[in-house]
Interface confidence: medium
């Protein structure tokens, strides 16, 4: 886990304390009263203590060379970009209509959601995107997927099986050019069958954070750099999906 | 450069269809959604809906959903809308425009007029 | 679908600073809304100003600013020049469609 402030995340944002987001990013600094990791609700939550998580790897050990968001992305005009390599049919979903007002402040239409579910995301990623998934695991899951397109790559692919080999793991990898780059494997696994879950992803300028029922999960470096073009996010896999929406912070 | 060029003004008959392009040049094609936009004389703007050239998965202006049918052809990086059982209703400025979290580039609008 | 409202036309003079608002009608515009500003000048010519509520496009001139006001988005135009009187259309995202403003026509006299 990383000790970013708030200050470091949001550095140059002109906003050090932006709505929905703890005092602090991951642990409080000293002097904050010892409450570490402070998380407010639908805020992306404090990261752990180091070695909070078991089987972690340590900082530094994930390949995928982290990368600043370009400064100025490529022209454009409307929200909406694209998407992915077509896995994620957009027929018979809701979204697919346009008739659907969002929710709240943004997301997916109200109601259970088709699986596999495409949200569009306006105008690609961006540093301080939060993207939230509710939703409950089905009973003797096997696989859940989320894939944050760009094209026909997969900038990331996180991949929580639940029997792979008799144990429970967590992939992230990225794939380019029709081809899978290396692993990055967690061992830490909090999702359960039959289970609700909540799957925060925050985008900072050199990676995704992840955090699963309000607990930091795992960061994953951008290997795509071109975020702005990151325009989808597929989400497939043994659920029932409740909502699917995105915020700034 | 970005470029967006669109094909020329159209004359057609009511009931009749017409098919419009838009050619994109100077970005990644299948990097961004495609919108089609529509103006009538003196009236502001309708999205029609949005098209994602990657894999052509396209999301509709409800309103539009039985008239325009989006398609793209990556080969040639262009997107074309083609508009069915016209009426003067459908006489407009129809305008393409990428996306992206910065805003920036639309086409120079192509005229369509219907009448008998 | 939601409804987009913005003023309908603004007079301003060179040098002087104004600013158009843009409202929907499903309650406070937020950065999920992604809310674009866009210019219209005569012959169809459009250029895309603002993105992402606060983002210039590259080429945009610095006078130019997106930012959230109250429960509405805003575009600001600091210094305004003669150049700038055009017709400005907002545009916010509605979780998969996009509903335009009905424009504000700026006069600078």
């Known amino acids: 886990a990383d000790n970013f402030s708030l200050h470091d995340a949001l550095s140059g944002s002109g906003n050090p304390n932006p709505q929905g987001w703890p005092g602090a990013w991951g642990n409080q600094p000293a002097g904050a009263g010892g409450y570490p990791g402070a998380s407010y609700p639908g805020a992306y939550p404090g990261q752990a203590p180091p070695g909070a998580y078991p089987g972690q790897a340590p900082p530094g050990a994930y390949p995928g060379a982290p990368g600043a968001y370009p400064g100025a992305p490529a022209p454009g005009v409307y929200p909406g970009p694209p998407s992915g390599p077509g896995a994620y049919p957009s027929s018979g979903q809701p979204s697919a209509t346009g008739a659907y007002p969002a929710t709240g402040p943004y997301g997916a239409p109200a109601g259970p959601l088709i699986v596999p579910y495409n949200l569009p995301l306006p105008g690609g990623v961006v540093p301080r995107m939060l993207i939230t998934i509710l939703g409950t695991v089905k009973p003797n899951a096997n696989r859940i997927a989320l894939d944050f397109q760009r094209g026909n790559d997969v900038a990331f692919h996180f991949n929580p099986r639940f029997n792979e080999n008799n144990r429970r793991v967590i992939v992230c990898n990225t794939k380019l050019d029709n081809n899978w780059g290396r692993e990055e494997r967690q061992s830490v696994f909090p999702f359960e069958s039959g289970k609700p879950f909540k799957i925060q992803v925050l985008v900072e300028p050199d990676h995704f954070k992840v955090a699963v029922n309000d607990a930091h999960l795992l960061q994953y470096n951008h290997r795509v750099k071109k975020l702005n073009e990151i325009s989808k996010l597929g989400i497939s896999g043994d659920i029932d999906l409740t909502s699917a929406s995105y915020t700034m912070i | 450069q970005v470029q967006l060029q669109q094909s020329g003004a159209e004359l057609v008959r009511p009931g009749a269809s017409v098919k419009l392009s838009c050619k994109a040049s100077?970005?990644?094609?299948?990097?961004?959604?495609l919108n089609w936009v529509k103006q009538r004389p003196g009236q502001g703007l309708e999205w029609i809906g949005m098209?994602?050239?990657?894999?052509?998965?396209?999301h509709y202006n409800q309103v539009f959903k039985d008239k325009a049918t989006m398609t793209v052809d990556r080969s040639s990086s262009t997107a074309y809308m083609q508009l069915s059982g016209l009426t003067s209703e459908d006489s407009a400025v129809y305008y393409c425009?990428?996306?992206?979290?910065?805003?920036?580039?639309w086409g120079q609008g192509t005229t369509l007029t219907v009448s008998s | 679908q939601a409804v987009v409202t913005q003023e309908s036309a603004l007079t301003t003079s060179p040098g002087e600073t104004v600013t158009l608002t843009c409202r929907s009608s499903t309650g406070a515009v937020t950065t999920s809304n992604y809310a674009n500003w866009d210019q219209e000048k005569p012959d169809h010519l459009f250029t895309g100003l603002i993105g992402g509520t606060n983002n210039r496009a590259p080429g945009v001139p610095a006078r130019f600013s997106g930012s959230l006001i109250g429960d509405k988005a805003a575009l600001t135009i600091t210094g305004a020049q003669t150049e700038d009187e055009a017709i400005y259309f907002c545009?916010?995202?509605?979780?998969?469609?996009?509903?335009f403003g009905g424009g504000t026509k700026v006069t600078v006299l």
């Open positions: 545009a916010l995202w509605y979780s998969n469609h996009l509903v």
């Open positions: 425009a990428n996306s992206n979290y910065a805003s920036g580039s």
């Open positions: 098209i994602d050239p990657s894999d052509s998965e396209t």
């Open positions: 100077g970005y990644t094609f299948t990097g961004y959604w």
